[in-house]
């Protein structure tokens, strides 16, 4: 009788991560008596995948009923394949022995290749806000894909960026890979509504490339411009001084009025007007009773925006032309409900 052969018909198979892999193995004879075992890898460090006689292998099922007397099919199915399952699998026939079974013959092996999709790209920006004209870095990361080939592109508002560096790790062979890219973006005053997009394309993706986004509204700080102006009011001896705070982002803003260096009133910006570009305007006004002042008054509008050092704009109020009224006080008015967009 011809000597038993272990036949693994598939030299290689490829499986998508999450699917099942069927590893085929048949023997040509029932003799010698003894079990079949499946291993990943060869040599002393090989990993036992399935033992016909003993052990618990929750992800492995046999394709045919091994308890049947004349069974010669020892194919197995491994469920929920991950990239870590990649490797060469050997179907090995053992001869019954005492106390241990003796390896009799091995199949030629089946190489299992696993294709896995990249994870959704995650884009992260700088920890601190930056102002227009500054260059900021964004990073994009995606993990767990196989094979290694992958393309990554950066876009700002649909326009492809060219200033970026990308690495795919590890450099050598691995069961799965990660990609890391850093892009440099120059901020402009119009970037409040802008988006930075990282786009990853891979052979496993049936749809369009995967995209990760970052909103520049979380990165940019647009400092305000200030303008202090004076308007007469109907009531004699009263002057309305307004401070227009224009084109700032984010909203967090505190305004202080100073009269000759002394704090007159502090208020926090509440009802803001949003501009088309996403920045905000705000207007505060101060009603000054000029008869309360003998000398000219220096009015200062001081703005602290988003925790940054204060910026200010001053206005000299000439009082010499007005008749003096003893004992009257400065009457600060409330901030206007809204300011017209510029």
């Amino acid at each position: 009788e011809e000597e038993l052969q272990v036949i693994q018909p598939d030299k290689s198979i490829s499986v998508a991560a999450g699917e099942s892999a069927t590893l085929h193995c048949t023997v040509t004879s029932l003799i010698p008596v003894g079990p079949i075992q499946w291993f990943r890898g060869a040599g002393p460090g090989r990993e036992l995948i399935y033992n016909q006689k003993e052990g618990h292998f929750p992800r492995v099922t046999t394709v045919s009923d091994l308890t049947k007397r004349n069974n010669m099919d020892f194919s197995i199915r491994i469920s929920n394949i991950t990239p870590a399952d990649a490797g060469t699998y050997y179907c090995v026939k053992f001869r019954k022995g005492s106390p241990d079974h003796v390896e009799f013959k091995s199949g030629a092996g089946t190489e299992l290749s696993v294709r896995a999709k990249p994870s959704a790209p995650v884009v992260s920006g700088p920890a601190a806000r930056a102002t227009p004209q500054h260059t900021v870095s964004f990073t994009c990361e995606s993990h767990g894909f196989s094979p290694r080939d992958i393309t990554l592109k950066w876009f700002k508002n649909g326009n492809e960026l060219s200033d970026f560096q990308t690495n795919v790790d590890p450099a050598g062979d691995s069961v799965s890979y990660s990609i890391h890219s850093t892009a440099k973006v120059v901020l402009t005053r119009e970037d409040v509504h802008s988006q930075v997009i990282c786009e990853v394309a891979h052979v496993t993706l049936q749809g369009d490339p995967l995209r990760g986004t970052a909103n520049l509204s979380e990165t940019i700080r647009v400092p305000p411009t200030l303008e202090v102006t004076q308007q007469p009011v109907r009531a004699e001896n009263q002057v309305n001084v307004t401070c227009q705070v224009r084109k700032f982002y984010p909203q967090r803003l505190q305004l202080t009025w100073l009269e000759n260096g002394n704090v007159s009133r502090t208020e926090t910006a509440s009802t803001l007007t949003e501009n088309k570009d996403g920045t905000y305007n705000w207007m505060s006004w101060l009603l000054v009773n000029v008869s309360a002042h003998r000398d000219d008054v220096k009015l200062t509008c001081q703005v602290e925006h988003d925790g940054q050092p204060a910026v200010s704009k001053s206005h000299d109020l000439k009082v010499s032309a007005h008749p003096k009224e003893q004992g009257s006080n400065t009457a600060p008015g409330p901030a206007l409900a809204s300011a017209a967009p510029l």
Epitope: K11, S12, S14, V15, A16, S113, R115, P147, D149, I150, T151, A201, H202, V203, T204, L205, Q206, G207, D208
Partner: antibody, heavy 116, light 109 residues
């Protein structure tokens, strides 16, 4: 799983023609689909694909003359400004479940003849 | 665009012969190469994908090898039903585009 092309016929140069690929046994929203053609006695030529989400991508030679679109069960190829060199059998195909680098299911093809 | 050069363009062989068809890419396509069989008046049929993986239901006499730019389709023992035209097809992962070789017609000697 089946693909069937339709719409192939004799067309005049300069006119337009729309071919359809009707699928059964799977969802078009899960796979990339492609259009190919083969002129009589010649080799296979790639025209374009449409992604599972509906974005089309074309071979560089197409130059806007062909448009690929899809509904829930059909994928269409609209051909404008027909030329005699567009005479071919047109095939639709589905990419494999493991990735977009190969096509494992093909329709039988539909013949387009462009002649005056 | 990538060019795929297939050779020979035709060959004559007998049943039982070992047949080898080669395909060369103008630039590296790693292992993104498929082989198809086409018979007259029929649609192409997938034989091999990812350069070396046998598609389900395809007889084991068909095998593929190669990576980078040079690829081979081998039929170990030609059968009567194997007389057909064979095409290689590449996919380029950067341009995400497909290119076919010009075909190899396998005829009966």
């Amino acid at each position: 799983v089946q693909l069937v092309e339709s719409g192939g016929r004799l067309g005049q140069p300069g006119t337009s023609l729309t071919l359809s690929c009707t699928v059964s046994g799977f969802s078009l929203s899960s796979y990339v689909m492609g259009w190919f053609r083969q002129a009589p006695g010649k080799g296979l030529e790639y025209i374009g694909i449409i992604s599972s989400s509906g974005s089309p991508y074309y071979a560089s030679w197409v130059n806007g003359r062909f448009t690929i679109s899809k509904t829930s069960t059909t994928m269409d190829l609209k051909m404008n400004s027909l030329r005699s060199e567009d005479t071919a059998t047109y095939f639709c195909a589905r990419v494999g479940p493991l990735g977009v680098d190969y096509f494992n299911i093909w329709g039988p093809g539909t013949l387009v003849t462009v002649s005056s | 665009d990538i060019q795929m050069t297939q050779s020979p363009s035709s060959l004559s062989a007998s049943v039982g012969d070992r047949v080898t068809i080669t395909c060369r890419a103008s630039q590296s396509i790693n292992s993104y190469l498929a082989w198809y069989q086409q018979k007259p008046g029929k649609a192409p049929k997938l034989l091999i994908y990812s350069a070396s993986f046998l598609y389900s239901g395809v007889p084991s006499r068909f095998s593929g090898s190669g990576s980078g730019t040079d690829f081979t389709l081998t039929i170990s023992s030609l059968q009567p039903e194997d007389f057909a035209t064979y095409y290689c097809q590449s996919w380029h992962y950067i341009s995400r585009s497909y290119t076919f070789g010009q075909g190899t017609k396998v005829e009966i000697k």
